[in-house]
């Protein structure tokens, strides 16, 4: 089936926005005013995955770029990366597992759990201007809660 997608931005629970940091990395920092235009717009696609009544499988692409967040092992550690794909073939309903995140809504906040690595989440640091990463702990120092803002196409 044609994949359903929406455009959105994400902010962590400390209100930090996500921006590009080099060609293949995202970082989180507080933005205000005109600087808000720097934040990345995601194309969130609703894909096949191990869907449950409270987990919705999604893929997170960067709008109008052929880049998707993906989860891979690097030096034996689950790692978040931006991966380049063939724009002719993506997005698709049947994404490879490394591209899939379980979107979990709890108390109006969103978590994004890696489908490839259960209990690992898209995370940001408390500190400013640090990379967005895949974290294996919830409720600790690192931030795993996000809010989503819809962006018109």
């Amino acid at each position: 089936a044609p994949v359903r997608s929406l455009n959105c931005t994400l902010r962590d629970s400390q209100q930090k926005s996500l921006v590009m940091s080099g060609p293949y990395e995202l970082k989180a920092l507080h933005l205000q005013g005109q600087d808000m235009e720097q934040q990345v717009v995601f194309s969130m696609s609703f894909v096949q995955g191990e869907e449950s009544n409270d987990k919705i499988p999604v893929a997170l692409g960067l709008k109008e770029k052929n880049l998707y967040l993906s989860c891979v092992l690097k030096d034996d550690k689950p790692t978040l990366q931006l991966e380049s794909v063939d724009p002719k073939n993506y997005p698709k309903k049947k994404m490879e597992k490394r591209f899939v995140f379980n979107k979990i809504e709890i108390n109006n906040k969103l978590e994004f759990e890696s489908a490839q690595f259960p209990n690992w989440y898209i995370s940001t640091s408390q500190a400013e201007n640090m990379p967005v990463f895949l974290g294996g702990t919830k409720g600790g120092q690192d931030i795993t809660d996000f809010t989503m803002q819809f962006v018109s196409s």
Partner: antibody, heavy 122, light 107 residues
Framework: EVQLVESGGGLVQPGGSLRLSCAVS????????VSWIRQAPGKGLEWLGL???????YYNSPLKSRLTISKDNSKSTVYLQMNSLRAEDTAVYYC????????????????WGQGTLVTVSS | ETTVTQSPSSLSASVGDRVTITCITS??????MNWYQQKPGKPPKLLIS???TLRPGVPSRFSSSGSGTDFTFTISSLQPEDFATYYC?????????FGQGTKLEIK
């Protein structure tokens, strides 16, 4: 060889509950999802819900409040608990293995058990 | 939820006949349609999985076609053992949904 064997069916009083078991072999429950499906006498097939390899569950909305699917990986067994039974829950209950092929066919079901008959009657 | 409308609900045919069953879905499901055969007192048996793929060991007289919302299942030359009930199942999205079934009877 993949096999699924249901058990636990029988006569249940209206308002009662049932707990069915599905013992599997030939595959590991931590890797594959398992669905429950039922078929009322002379009727079609109705999908009830599933449990994924990681333990997450999805229930079909009309029955969500009355169903619990669980599993014990070490016993290679999946369970279906259903509460507040009524006459229209009388059916053969099947479990089936999900294909769980990422990027290809995640939701299709390939192997089915023989089924167990549940009769709800006073 | 994707609803699946299967027709006909019953069908009388003779050995050697060509038989066609249709399933129409309420949403575009790409090629994610599956076809099952069920005989009395037995569980459904998967004949054709999504992508119109014939399962290993299933005779080549069984075939299917279609994508999007319109799907067809064909038995090219009916054999005595083919008299059974046939179901389609969409596996594009949850909840999984079946067609109402087609009972194939001897004329």
């Amino acid at each position: 060889e993949v096999q699924l064997v249901e058990s636990g069916g029988g006569l249940v009083q209206p308002g009662g509950s049932l707990r069915l078991s599905c013992a599997v072999s030939g595959f590991t429950l931590s890797d594959y999802g398992v669905s429950w499906i039922r078929q009322a006498p002379g009727k079609g097939l109705e999908w009830l819900g599933l449990i994924w390899g990681g333990g997450d569950t999805y229930y079909n909305s009309p029955l969500k409040s009355r169903l619990t699917i669980s599993k014990d990986n070490s016993k290679s067994t999946v369970y279906l608990q259903m509460n507040s039974l009524r006459a229209e829950d009388t059916a053969v209950y099947y479990c089936a293995k999900q294909r769980t092929l990422w990027g290809y066919d995640l939701y299709g079901m390939d192997y089915w058990g023989q089924g167990t008959l549940v009769t709800v009657s006073s | 939820e994707t609803t699946v409308t299967q027709s006909p609900s019953s069908l009388s045919a003779s050995v050697g006949d060509r038989v066609t069953i249709t399933c129409i879905t309420s949403t575009d499901i790409d090629v994610d349609m599956n076809w099952y055969q069920q005989k009395p007192g037995k569980p459904p048996k998967l004949l054709i999985s999504q992508g119109n793929t014939l399962r290993p060991g299933v005779p080549s007289r069984f075939s299917s076609s279609g994508s999007g919302t319109d799907f067809t299942f064909t038995i090219s030359s009916l054999q005595p053992e083919d008299f059974a009930t046939y179901y389609c199942l969409q596996s594009d999205n949850l909840p999984l949904t079946f067609g109402q079934g087609t009972k194939l009877e001897i004329k």
